[in-house]
Interface confidence: medium
């Protein structure tokens, strides 16, 4: 199939980084500055994405690949290919229409993005609460009394009231 296609369509010989220029008898011409073609056989090159404003350049555009953006400090990416930047909040907060708000009691957020999530209900899993939750951290579930076989460690290290950093999901 590929061989047949190349006999019928000379453009299929044009590699990535070029385009098939109809104005020049279908000669493969390099993509102009600030444009790219990531696949062969293209009849046009695509304009490079420009990372402006709250976006910053993570990867420069080349003749064969588009630029990639991320967000300036204080913001994080949302959407495929970082199509949007959303404001960071502090751990223990979530972003609402009115800005960053503290997590309600019984919920936590251990990241600078996303929503406050309910503390885990340890009892649903037959466990007990080993360490209480905070706005920034989920509870830590411990074994149920039945799980503590003789000789098993039941020493609980002290948990700081407010711990630095964040715990991941």
């Amino acid at each position: 199939f590929e061989r047949t296609r190349s006999l019928q369509d000379p453009c299929s010989n044009c590699p990535a980084g070029t385009f098939c220029d109809n104005n020049r008898n279908q000669i493969c011409s390099p993509c102009p500055p600030n444009s790219f073609s990531s696949a062969g056989g293209q009849r046009t090159c695509d304009i490079c994405r420009q990372c402006k404003g709250v976006f910053r350049t993570r990867k420069e555009c080349s003749s064969t690949s588009n630029a990639e953006c991320d967000c300036t400090p204080g913001f994080h990416c949302l959407g495929a290919g970082c199509s949007m930047c959303e404001q960071d909040c502090k751990q223990g907060q979530e972003l609402t229409k009115k800005g960053c708000k503290d997590c309600c009691f019984g919920t936590f957020n251990d990241q600078k993005r996303g929503i406050c999530r309910p503390w885990t209900n340890c009892s649903l899993d037959g466990k007990s609460v080993l360490v209480n939750g905070t706005k920034e951290r989920d509870v830590v579930c411990g074994p149920s009394p039945a799980d503590l076989s003789p000789g098993a460690s039941s020493v609980t290290p002290p948990a700081p009231a407010r711990e630095p950093g964040h715990s991941p999901q």
Partner: antibody
Amino acid sequence: QVQLQQPGAELVRPGASVKLSCKASGYIFTSYWINWVKQRPGQGLEWIGNIYPSDSYTNYNQKFKDKATLTVDKSSSTAYMQLSSPTSEDSAVYYCTRFHYGSSPFDNWGQGTTLTVSS
Amino acid sequence: DIQMTQSTSSLSASLGDRVTISCRASQDISHYLNWYQQKPDGTVKLLIYYTSRLHSGVPSRFSGSGSGTDYSLTISNLEQEDFATYFCQQGHTLPRTFGGGTKLEIK
């Protein structure tokens, strides 16, 4: 009992994307995070990212952000990890593992899928 | 990222011995430290979580201790099935990170 079932092996050509699966059983799928961990031959373990099946909320290790895409199918209690443009560097054992709550440990692991990237 | 260092990559011991495997974090991880065992066939199991809590079904010859940045796993009275590779992992900060592993071999 809790089980995370993974295919034993997958073979993929360089550049062709691959989707690894992890079928969960024996617990409420939507209540536990599914994580993916990479282990190269003779090497340590690397956390790739995780997904909360209830709402498909994901976290990624920055190192794998452009390589891995995590999804779930709640109807079949299966988690997936798609690897884009695989190279020989992606040849490894990939484990799925679960945990319940923030900071909790990985309490159950799949057997791992050995991915071979070769032409 | 928090770096987890297991300074001993392999360790030889005999049946009945008591061994201690250490793990150091590049910053305080407030006891959010877990230990796993990996058998030669690749099977991975949780042993200890939150520094010293024994996971259900794990024999009491396994114990964990530590605080701040320094943690350890102790296996007393080694049995044949304990010869495996042991990994520490921090659950404090994204991304979750593991130590490089300590392979426990029979002397």
